[in-house]
Amino acid sequence: PRSIDVKYIGVKSAYVSYDVQKRTIYLNITNTLNITNNNYYSVEVENITAQVQFSKTVIGKARLNNITIIGPLDMKQIDYTVPTVIAEEMSYMYDFCTLISIKVHNIVLMMQVTVTTTYFGHSEQISQERYQYVDCGRNTTYQLGQSEYLNVLQPQQ
């Protein structure tokens, strides 16, 4: 069998809502993956599991099942959404994300995704990790790759 390539493209959009009483931020983050099947037979994308971390704390998880079948030598772009919650114990985050005197409220999040593919009863898992900027202060749509955080060694806000 030839390889199945998974490429994390980036954040597509982030939609924000708040709970004022709980000082909690809800971020629905939609990410984009490119999955390429380099084989001469079809493969099934069985599931995608994803999680989002802020400062080593997991703030959101998602799992998609029975997603799609990718034909021989074909590529599919898949969007998946991870609902995240930045809760009361991080109230300094609420303060920053709701600061109205500044326009962009970028935080650095670590996106982790694992794609499970199957073919002829055989399962394969491919994982990716990327740091991404996300604006926690307003609804934002990104051009693909625009949210990339390049300094992966020392993520600072």
């Epitope: 004022v20 500044i102 970028n106 806000q157």
Partner: antibody
Framework: DVQLQQSGAELVRPGASVKLSCTAS????????MYWVKQRPEQGLEWIGR????????ENAPKFRGMATMTADTSSNTAYLQLNSLTSEDTAVYYC?????????????WGHGTSVTVSS | DVLMTQTPLSLPVSLGDQASISCRSS???????????LEWYLQKPGQAPKLLID???NRFSGVPDRFSGSGSGTDFTLKISRVEAEDLGVYYC?????????FGSGTKLEIK
């Protein structure tokens, strides 16, 4: 190093217009709001308004609507304030200001101010 | 517009004294997101204003801890525990919760 460099002092006739500039260095203005504040001699501070340089969206104090127009040019990283139909009441120092922040640190930056004198 | 009323207009103090400046807004300046964007600035002669305190009580970067802010709703106070010569100037409160944002009329802190 973040700086807001404002244009030089202006002496203008009543009824005339003037366009003040505020050129930013050390950051990209399209990612930040730019604010304008007026201060008449020996008087307090008045908030004129703010602009989002990325899309030109503005919010003005009602008092300044029609007479103060905020614009921005992201290619030159400059915000502008145009003052129209000037009267002696518009003799003042005009400041541009912005606030730049991240999760751990927020900074408030002001230009040195542009003095506008309206006199015949 | 939200009217910000500062008292007193002038505050003569001796160095080392405590100073207290009051600011009252004509309506609540609690933003819909739950935060209160009440700020205090100090302006020295010939200079641009400098931000001392934001969101009622958060001391800004580099501001000495002798400055403290308090209050809620419509009533706010700036206290300077021991006035130093470098603290002299005009203090302004400012609300950034409701457009148009507005400044108070200013309080001049001067030597008695």
């Amino acid at each position: 190093d973040v700086q807001l460099q404002q244009s030089g002092a202006e002496l203008v006739r009543p009824g005339a217009s003037v366009k003040l500039s505020c050129t930013a260095s050390g950051f990209n203005i399209k990612d930040y709001y730019m604010y304008w504040v007026k201060q008449r001699p020996e008087q307090g501070l008045e908030w004129i308004g703010r602009i989002d340089p990325e899309d030109g969206d503005t919010e003005n104090a009602p008092k300044f609507r029609g007479m103060a127009t905020m614009t921005a040019d992201t290619s030159s990283n400059t915000a502008y304030l145009q003052l129209n139909s000037l009267t002696s009441e518009d003799t003042a120092v005009y400041y541009c200001t912005t606030r730049i922040g991240n999760l751990y640190h927020v900074m408030d930056y002001w230009g040195h101010g542009t003095s506008v004198t309206v006199s015949s | 517009d939200v009217l910000m009323t500062q008292t007193p207009l002038s505050l003569p103090v001796s160095l080392g004294d405590q100073a207290s400046i009051s600011c009252r807004s004509s309506q609540s300046i609690v933003h819909s997101n739950g935060n209160t964007y009440l700020e205090w600035y100090l302006q020295k002669p010939g200079q641009a204003p400098k931000l001392l305190i934001d969101k009622v009580f958060n001391r800004f970067s580099g501001v000495p801890d002798r400055f403290s802010g308090s209050g809620s709703g419509t009533d706010f106070t700036l206290k300077i525990s021991r006035v130093e010569a470098e603290d002299l100037g005009v203090y302004y409160c400012f609300q950034g919760s409701h457009v148009p944002f507005t400044f108070g009329s200013g309080t001049k802190l001067e030597i008695k």
